[in-house]
């Protein structure tokens, strides 16, 4: 516990004090107090450098002396023979002696008292930076006028912080500036600007003049910039040693000016102002930037349009420019878009079509449709080679978007008809010579495919059944051949406007308009044993003459059963209308007179017997295209007869073209549009 | 019309072979296609087997495979199943059928022919 | 092979009745299916083909319905001729094969 005074006397003083004793006193007065330590009493056995016995006084680390010997005042008034005064408020004394003493030493009679010490003048570093004023037991620093005192309580600075400048434009120097500046002072200035404008500081060489740097290079009095995470500086020195246009790149700065103890010059002065955050000019490959300009600051806006062929794409959309926004913090709004190759995606099938599997979808990639060969066509032209355009469509040169269409070939038999022996007379077929054969099994009869839709036939095939059940593909009727074929389901059965629809069609004698379509469900698949026949043309070039050869098929009646299990077929000529009128009818159901004959209907047959007959009906009469020699188009319809194995009547197609167009148009769907 | 004429009853050891003959009447052979099916007695319909004459081949039952034989005699309008290695099992009345048209299974079926196996 | 199971294997009922047989295919048979009158001594009769035509000269109180594995014959009004043994058949492949029976008697 620290002590105003105090004493310290050696061991049995004022007896002799004995032999080899080490014994230590620990001083400590108050805080702010020195020791004034002063001996009245010295009696110990002298030695060089007092080696033997001694009183020793350590201040610190320091030794304040070392006593031995005997000393007497040289004041008759004062007792004092030795005294040490430190400006410190701890001491040490020890006291040691030897083994062996000649004569006998009394040893030391010691007083210690707090004295007041100076902190102003008694030390080599002054404690104040600029007044200190001592007191007992301690010391405070005052500053001069316009000065603080710093929070360590020692410094003065002067109050040069907390301006925070915010206009755009402004000039700040060090303080008195151009005078000296303050010693040991930091001052610091803010400069805010509104986000979107960075500081630009200037400067001019001879406006800046601080204290130089040590021979380290560290400055001592220094001028420092901070913007962000950026510093420009520490500069210091006789003119201004950095850049004298400093573009900070932010809205904020810091400017710190720290000066030390010494060394005071004139100071710095600097101007600065507020431009735009200027925004680089980006190379954002494939697109143009629209307004184009040298250089780009905050709120500036520009379109960046991508190329032709490329498209930008943000979520599942795809557009073809955007806008950028330079922003406050010196970058572009919509920074990640970017224009990116348009994509046309995976092609679109097309129906009875194939398109190869691209090795890119990418702008400018080019693709091609087929069609299922030999059996469809495409109809709407184009070569089906289609290319990635930059709308991200699949472009064909003469189609545009639009997709190619496959349709079935018409009238060409995968194998053409041989007849092989001696219908009625007819020979066995094979249903590739005639794919377009269609059986109806109630009532027993036959139809002809004109397209994937549609199935051509007598009207008085469907008269009595507006359901009717049909196949395609097989050449024997057979059940389990049929099970193995493709069953037709109808839509809607079609007959001509101009057929009499009668109470008791098996006494019928007028044939006239003997054709109806029927509208089938689903489309119906192309194959080898699948294909529609051609319709005729409108030009006279399809007008029958006499002796013209044609094909029919069917199921119909033969010499020797009622009804052919096999496909049969017969190649007749035309004849003259006449030469059925002629014919005797069979059984009839009615006066000969009463049968119509018509310009809409075809007279054929009449040699070796070949003939159609019962169930063969709406089966066609197969003519060769004319202008098309590997085709066959429908010149005609089974229709009726006078008596099998002579000549039969057929349905002059060619008469009702505008009608099956019609038909098939007002009732076609979207599917096949 | 068609008439379908069969051979008669038969009376087999077991091991043995039988070969019933269906002729065909009022018609070609080879207009048609011949199915032959059985029935052991008390039990129900079983089909054997056919000749598919638009590919030419015969297609038999699983069950009967490598046991039955069935072949056509065009110039007779004849049709012949053999069914070999006889079993008790194999006692049944064996008919012969035509295939019908147009959905129709089967047209006319023989009066059939009843074969015993017994030892 | 398509398998055709045939229910109920026996069906005791009166002369008036409505009676109702069906049959289920292992697998889908689209409408190729008949239906057959067997009496004891004679070779089965065919009544119904296409799953639902009526075979010509057999009374209208024969009926068959259905299409891809569900079928059904019925026999609105039983007259005391009907008592029988009816068949199902499917002819959708080559390989024929017949329901196991459904034996119609008197109660």
């Known amino acids: 516990e620290p002590t105003m005074y105090g004493e310290i006397l050696s061991p049995n003083y004022p007896q002799a004090y004995p032999s080899e004793v080490e014994k230590s006193w620990d001083i400590e007065v108050p805080e702010g107090y020195g020791i004034h330590l002063y001996f009245t009493h010295l009696d110990i056995e002298l030695s060089e450098n007092c080696a033997y016995d001694s009183v020793q006084i350590i201040s610190g680390d320091t030794e304040e002396g070392r006593l031995c010997g005997q000393r007497s005042s040289n004041n008759p008034h004062s007792p004092i023979v030795e005294e040490f005064q430190v400006p410190y408020n701890k001491l040490q004394v020890i006291f040691k002696s030897d083994f062996s003493n000649e004569e006998r030493f009394t040893g030391f009679a010691a007083y210690y008292v707090a004295t007041d010490i100076n902190e102003c003048t008694d030390f080599v570093d002054v404690p104040c930076s600029h007044f200190c004023n001592n007191f007992i037991g301690g010391y405070f620093c005052s500053c001069p006028p316009e000065y603080f005192l710093h929070d360590d309580m020692k410094n003065c600075g002067v109050n040069c912080s907390g301006d925070v400048f915010t206009a755009l434009i402004g000039e700040i120097a060090s303080p008195n500036y151009p005078k000296p500046y303050p010693e040991n002072s930091r001052c610091e200035y803010q400069i805010r600007l509104e986000k979107g404008f960075q500081v630009v500081v200037t400067l001019r060489r001879e406006d800046f003049d601080v204290e130089a740097a040590d021979s380290a290079g560290n400055c001592l009095d220094s001028l420092v910039f901070v913007a962000g995470d950026r510093q420009f500086g520490p500069y210091c020195g006789h003119g201004f040693p950095g850049p004298l246009n400093i573009e900070t790149k932010s809205n904020a700065l810091d400017i710190i000016f720290q000066t030390d103890l010494t060394g005071q010059k004139k100071g710095w002065k600097l101007r600065y102002h507020g431009d735009p955050m200027p925004c680089p000019k980006e190379d954002t490959p494939n697109s143009v930037w629209e307004p184009a300009k040298a250089k780009y600051v905050f709120r500036d806006v520009v379109q960046i349009t991508c190329l032709d062929g490329f498209e930008v794409v943000e979520g599942r959309v795809g557009a073809t420019s955007f806008y950028s926004t330079c922003q406050s913090n010196g970058k572009w709004s919509n920074s990640k878009l970017k224009c990116q190759p348009v994509d046309c995606g995976i092609p679109e099938s097309i129906e009875n079509g194939k398109v190869e599997d691209p090795e890119s979808t990418l702008f400018g990639s080019v693709i091609r449709y087929t069609c299922e060969e030999p059996y469809y066509y495409m109809e709407n032209g184009g070569g089906g080679e289609y290319h990635c355009a930059g709308n991200g469509s699949w472009v064909n040169e003469v189609l545009g978007p639009e997709l190619p269409k496959c349709v079935p070939v018409c009238g060409v038999p995968r194998e053409p008809f041989e007849e092989k022996q001696r219908i009625i007379g007819g020979s066995d077929a094979d249903i590739k010579n005639f794919p377009w054969q269609v059986f109806f099994d109630n009532p027993w009869a036959g139809g002809a495919l004109i397209n994937e839709y549609w199935v051509l036939t007598a009207a008085h095939v469907v008269e009595g059944n507006r359901e009717p059940t049909m196949y395609v593909g097989s050449t024997s009727v057979q059940t389990s051949r049929l099970a193995k074929s493709k069953m037709l389901t109808p839509e809607h059965v079609f007959i001509h406007p101009g057929w009499k629809l009668l109470e008791v069609p098996e006494g019928r004698t007028n044939f006239d308009n003997d054709i109806a379509l029927v509208r089938l469900k689903d489309p119906v698949k192309m194959g080898p044993t699948v294909s529609p026949i051609c319709l005729p043309g409108t030009s006279s070039d399809y007008n029958l003459m006499d002796g013209d050869l044609g094909l029919i098929s069917g199921w119909g009646r033969t010499e020797k059963r009622d009804r052919a299990v096999r496909l049969k077929a017969a190649r007749l000529p035309v004849a003259p209308l006449r030469k059925c009128k002629e014919v005797k009818v069979e059984k009839p159901t009615a006066d000969a007179e009463a049968y119509v004959f018509t310009p809409n209907m075809i007279c054929a047959g009449g040699e070796k017997g070949m003939d159609s007959c019962k169930g063969d009906s709406g089966g066609a009469f197969a003519v060769q295209d004319p202008n098309d020699k590997t085709k066959f188009y429908a010149a005609g319809l089974v229709s009726w007869g006078p008596q099998c194995g002579t000549y039969g009547l057929y349905t002059r197609v060619k008469n009702y073209v505008d009608w099956i167009m019609k038909t098939m148009q007002e009732n076609s769907t979207p599917r096949e549009d | 019309q068609v008439q379908l004429v069969q051979s008669g009853a038969e009376v087999k050891k077991p091991g043995a072979s039988v070969k019933v003959s269906c002729k065909v009447s009022?018609?070609?052979?080879?207009?048609?296609?011949m199915h032959w099916v059985r029935q052991a007695p008390g039990k129900g319909l079983e089909w054997m087997g056919t000749f598919d004459p638009e590919e030419g081949e015969t297609i038999y039952a699983q069950k009967f495979q490598g046991r039955v034989t069935m072949t056509e005699d065009t110039s007779t309008d004849t049709a012949y199943m053999e069914l070999s290695s006889l079993r008790s099992e194999d006692t049944a009345v064996y008919y012969c059928?035509?295939?019908?048209?147009?959905?129709?299974?089967?047209?006319?079926w023989g009066q059939g022919t009843l074969v015993t196996v017994s030892s | 092979d398509i398998q055709m199971t045939q229910s109920p294997s026996t069906l005791s009922a009166s002369v008036g009745d409505r009676v109702t047989i069906t049959c289920r295919a292992s697998?889908?048979?689209?409408?190729?299916l008949a239906w057959y009158q067997q009496k004891p001594g004679k070779a089965p009769k065919l009544l119904i083909y296409k799953a639902s035509s009526l075979e010509s000269g057999v009374p209208s109180r024969f009926s068959g319905s259905g299409s891809g594995t569900e079928f059904t014959l019925t026999i609105s009004s039983l007259q005391p001729d009907d008592f029988a043994t009816y068949y199902c058949q499917q002819y959708n492949s080559y390989k024929l094969t017949f329901g196991q029976g459904t034996k119609v008697e008197i109660k």
């Open positions: 059928v035509t295939e019908g048209l147009a959905g129709r299974p089967y047209d006319v």
């Open positions: 697998q889908s048979i689209s409408s190729w």
């Open positions: 009022g018609d070609t052979l080879t207009e048609l296609s």
